[in-house]
Interface confidence: low
């Protein structure tokens, strides 16, 4: 069964850091372009960023609100995707989903909640 | 950046009736190199992650019932549910994956009349 499982969410103070993980199973992880998408409480979906696969240079792209603060990486040997979040702001409070893609986002995790509050 | 605009924001449809959701992109998401539209539709039910319904504007994802269909090209797209079922109550999002930053529409909440 294809599965993505996020972890690492929690409560953090503004200015703090958090690292999210997304463990993949049942798919050829190294082939997938992997994305992070977030959803603030009661709001719509917002794309955070993506990392391409190794053969495409593991290039990363980010949405403007997180550029320079968030960093996406992957470890294909562990089938794991990461989101390093620094300088967190209250507006970063959201459920964070990882989504595996064959271009469109075919597979989604269940999400992990990140709350940024003093 | 490409902006995705969905309409309507919410929609109430009777069971068995047809539901139509529209999505407009601020620039074309049609890639001339292969004549494909990089446009997807997702369904999100309460408390669940989104689920891919349609990619390439009109290709149903595996396991998606055939009452769901997508159409359109370039900048204007439509998701149609031909005969609404109770389990279709959800929020529907369109998304362009033509170029980063990838963008979702604001969502259309579909409920039963």
């Amino acid at each position: 069964e294809v599965q993505l499982v996020e972890s690492g969410g929690g409560l953090v103070k503004p200015g703090g850091s958090l690292r999210l993980s997304c463990a993949a199973s049942g798919l050829t992880f190294e082939r997938a372009w992997m994305n992070w998408v977030r959803q603030a409480p009661g709001k719509g979906l917002e794309w955070v960023g993506r990392i391409k696969r190794k053969t495409d240079g593991e290039t990363t792209d980010y949405a403007a609100p997180v550029k320079g603060r968030f960093s996406i990486s992957r470890d294909d040997s562990k089938n794991t995707l990461y989101l390093q979040m620094n300088s967190l702001k209250t507006e970063d409070t959201a459920v964070y989903y990882c989504a595996g893609s064959n271009r469109a986002f075919d597979i989604w995790g269940q999400g992990t909640m990140v709350t940024v509050s003093s | 950046d490409i902006v995705m605009t969905q309409s309507p924001d919410s929609l109430a449809v009777s069971l068995g009736e047809r539901a139509t959701i529209n999505c407009k992109s601020s620039q074309s998401v049609l890639y001339a190199g292969n004549n494909r539209n990089y446009l997807a539709w997702y369904q999100q039910k309460p408390g669940q992650p989104p689920k891919l319904l349609i990619n390439q504007a009109s290709t149903r994802a595996s396991g998606v019932p055939d009452r769901f269909s997508g159409s359109g090209s370039g900048t204007e797209f439509t998701l149609i549910i031909s005969s609404l079922q109770a389990e279709d109550v959800a929020i529907y999002y369109c998304q362009q994956y033509y170029t980063p930053p990838l963008a979702f529409g604001g969502g259309t909440k579909l409920e039963i009349k």
Partner: antibody, heavy 118, light 107 residues
Framework: EVQLQQSGPELEKPGASVKISCKAS????????MNWVKQGNGESLEWIGY????????RYNQNFKGKATLTVDKSSSTAYMQLKSLTSEDSAVYYC???????????WGQGTSVTVSP | DIVMTQSPATLSVTPGDRVSLSCRAS??????LHWYQQKSNESPRLLIK???QSISGIPSRFSGSGSGSDFTLNINSVEPEDVGVYYC?????????FGAGTKLELK
């Protein structure tokens, strides 16, 4: 178990065209690129190109542009390669090869021998 | 195009020998280098991916190393069934390119 079953040997006259097939089984056909590789008698391997069944996109080695056309039929999980304007230089064994690992060739068909002779 | 150069062209070995096959890329390809074995009258098969990653079902005597432009395939104790031609492949840039091969034979 992944299997790639290629069509049988072909004997063609110069100037003719030939279309060889590669029927895939044991995996989700649309998920991975299908490569085609040429091997002349006693020679090394030469990559012709690949087709991405998900979209039908193709990438070709410049040396084979205009010579080879790669297509797929998703309904039958079959990849095809057509070679046109055949000359003796086209006599070779042609392999289809599946890229489960991006830009590597994890699984190979048994090869199809094409002989071009007057 | 990236040119892949393999050496030696032929290698004569005795069962139990440790052997090293060399592959050089005409420009840096990081670790996007794959190795294949082709036995007589058979299709090639993938031995090593990304320079050093092992493949399920491939005996542990096969290992790979290298990065950038210089790569090595090692067979730590050659078996008679290892006779064949070994090819390296650039997986970095299109067109994908193969080396000319190293023929491994028994003395």
């Amino acid at each position: 178990e992944v299997q790639l079953q290629q069509s049988g040997p072909e004997l063609e006259k110069p100037g003719a065209s030939v279309k060889i097939s590669c029927k895939a089984s044991g995996y989700s056909f649309s998920d991975y690129n299908m490569n085609w590789v040429k091997q002349g008698n006693g020679e090394s391997l030469e990559w012709i190109g690949y087709v991405d069944p998900y979209y039908g996109d193709t990438r070709y080695n410049q040396n084979f542009k205009g010579k080879a056309t790669l297509t797929v039929d998703k309904s039958s999980s079959t990849a095809y390669m057509q070679l046109k304007s055949l000359t003796s230089e086209d006599s070779a064994v042609y392999y289809c090869a599946l890229s489960e690992t991006p830009r590597a060739m994890d699984y190979w068909g048994q090869g199809t021998s094409v002989t071009v002779s007057p | 195009d990236i040119v892949m150069t393999q050496s030696p062209a032929t290698l004569s070995v005795t069962p139990g020998d440790r052997v090293s096959l060399s592959c050089r890329a005409s420009q840096s390809i990081s670790d996007y280098l794959h190795w294949y074995q082709q036995k007589s009258n058979e299709s090639p098969r993938l031995l090593i991916k990304y320079a050093s990653q092992s493949i399920s079902g491939i005996p542990s005597r096969f290992s790979g190393s290298g990065s950038g432009s210089d790569f090595t395939l090692n067979i730590n104790s050659v078996e008679p069934e290892d006779v064949g031609v070994y090819y390296c492949q650039n997986g970095h840039s299109l067109p994908l390119t193969f080396g000319a091969g190293t023929k491994l034979e028994l003395k």
